[in-house]
């Protein structure tokens, strides 16, 4: 049975600033055919037929749901892209994470400007501070890492705060063993 294809992002953030670039790639098993990919944005078929969809100089209209399909195989699960205009943007490797998987958070400055005195907050409480910009990199996420995160920092000597982001860590499905 052919597997569903999967959409991946490069860079891996599904929240980006207006004007930035991102490439969506449709990964699947044994898809070697040229021009065999269908891309759907908010349900509408895109003109792109390559296995990669390049979004250059992102606009607000590029926000929304993306799915891909190889030949007659099932559509991929949707990926949601959101385009922002702000001073700070909290980016996450994933917003729903399986327990035991890594979780990476980044406090991204508009136009890649330097951000200083960055603080990450979780559920309203300061979580991590450093003099300059820095990341949070959790190797093995646990359910306790679930919560609402945001970051604050200084850009050009002024204080800014990102929009909040909900992160959910879900328990890995347990294998079922039947007694013989």
């Amino acid at each position: 049975v052919p597997q569903k294809p999967k959409v991946s992002l490069n860079p891996p953030w599904n929240r980006i600033f207006k004007g930035e670039n991102v490439t969506l790639t449709c990964n699947g098993n044994n898809f070697f055919e040229v021009s065999s990919t269908k891309w759907f944005h908010n349900g509408s078929l895109s003109e792109e037929t390559n296995s990669s969809l390049n979004i250059v100089n992102a606009k607000f209209e590029d926000s929304g749901e993306y799915k891909c399909q190889h030949q007659q195989v099932n559509e991929s699960e949707p990926v949601y892209l959101e385009v922002f205009s702000d001073w700070l943007l909290l980016q996450a490797s994933a917003e729903v994470v399986m327990e035991g998987q890594p979780l990476f958070l980044r406090c991204h400055g508009w136009r890649n400007w330097d951000v200083y005195k960055v603080i990450y907050y979780k559920d309203g409480e300061a979580l991590k501070y450093w003099y300059e910009n820095h990341n949070i990199s959790i190797t093995n996420a646990t359910v306790e890492d679930s919560g609402t995160y945001y970051c604050t920092g200084k850009v050009w000597q002024l204080d800014y705060e990102s929009e909040p982001l909900n992160i959910t860590v879900i328990k890995a499905p347990r294998e079922k063993y039947w007694l013989q």
């Epitope: 200083y116 990450y120 300061a126 979580l127 501070y129 300059e132 949070i136 959790i138």
Partner: antibody, heavy 120, light 112 residues
Framework: QVQLQQPGAELVRPGASVKLSCKAS????????MNWVNQRPGQGLEWIGM????????RLNPNFKDRATLTVDKSSSTAYMQLSSPTSEDSAVYYC?????????????WGQGTLVTVSA | DIVMTQSPLSLPVSLGDQASISCRSS???????????LEWYLQKPGQSPKLLIY???NRFSGVPDRFSGSGSGTDFTLKISRVEAEDLGVYYC?????????FGSGTKLEIK
């Protein structure tokens, strides 16, 4: 109130590794960097490194890069420093210390220190 | 690494006198974020160090106002306006601006 509890002393054979503990209480353990500082007998203070319990990010003094490993156990609010292949030069008091980088200081609360003696 | 050089190594004073300790860094410790993370600690015999001054000139709460810090760039000074018996011990300057963070070698304040 904030407390950092450390064992009083550890005797270790040269070449054997030693793991020092620092149990924190009275504050949100995952929200502050934990530092390790040592002091050889009759000498000054030396910063070894720091670890952030939220994600175990570590910043180490290059002098200790190959010999000190900093870890945390969030469930017990305990920070650890493992010193591998110690020599007599490593005999010292080892402190854990917590400050508030946001407010601009690194060491406000100190453990009582663990006296490590490296001796055959 | 940034080297912190303290002077003098020993400072004999009479109670009630003013004491002044100098600390020089081998390069500027003004961080690119605009702050200078220069701290002063006092360690009494058999005790852990105690924070006195942070970010060059900010007195930590509960620290008597006879303690003051000043300086910028690479030159810093701790002044004690009227030395009291409880002030005796070893004073350390410390830079927390750039990793690896470094302490000065210490200044022992003792009775003349």
């Amino acid at each position: 109130q904030v407390q950092l509890q450390q064992p009083g002393a550890e005797l270790v054979r040269p070449g054997a590794s030693v793991k020092l503990s620092c149990k924190a209480s009275g504050y949100s353990f995952t929200s502050y960097w934990m530092n390790w500082v040592n002091q050889r007998p009759g000498q000054g203070l030396e910063w070894i490194g720091m670890i952030h319990p939220s994600d175990s990010e570590t910043r180490l003094n290059p002098n200790f890069k190959d010999r000190a490993t900093l870890t945390v156990d969030k469930s017990s609010s305990t920070a650890y420093m493992q010193l591998s292949s110690p020599t007599s030069e490593d005999s010292a008091v080892y402190y854990c210390a917590r400050g508030s980088l946001y407010d601009g200081y690194l060491f406000l609360y100190w453990g009582q220190g663990t006296l490590v003696t490296v001796s055959a | 690494d940034i080297v912190m050089t303290q002077s003098p190594l020993s400072l004999p004073v009479s109670l009630g006198d003013q004491a002044s300790i100098s600390c020089r860094s081998s390069q500027s410790i003004l961080h690119s974020n605009g702050d200078t993370y220069l701290e002063w600690y006092l360690q009494k015999p058999g005790q852990s160090p105690k924070l006195l001054i942070y970010k060059v000139s900010n007195r930590f709460s509960g620290v008597p106002d006879r303690f003051s810090g000043s300086g910028s760039g690479t030159d810093f000074t701790l002044k004690i306006s009227r030395v009291e018996a409880e002030d005796l011990g070893v004073y350390y300057c410390f830079q927390g601006s750039y990793v690896p963070f470094t302490f000065g070698s210490g200044t022992k304040l003792e009775i003349k």
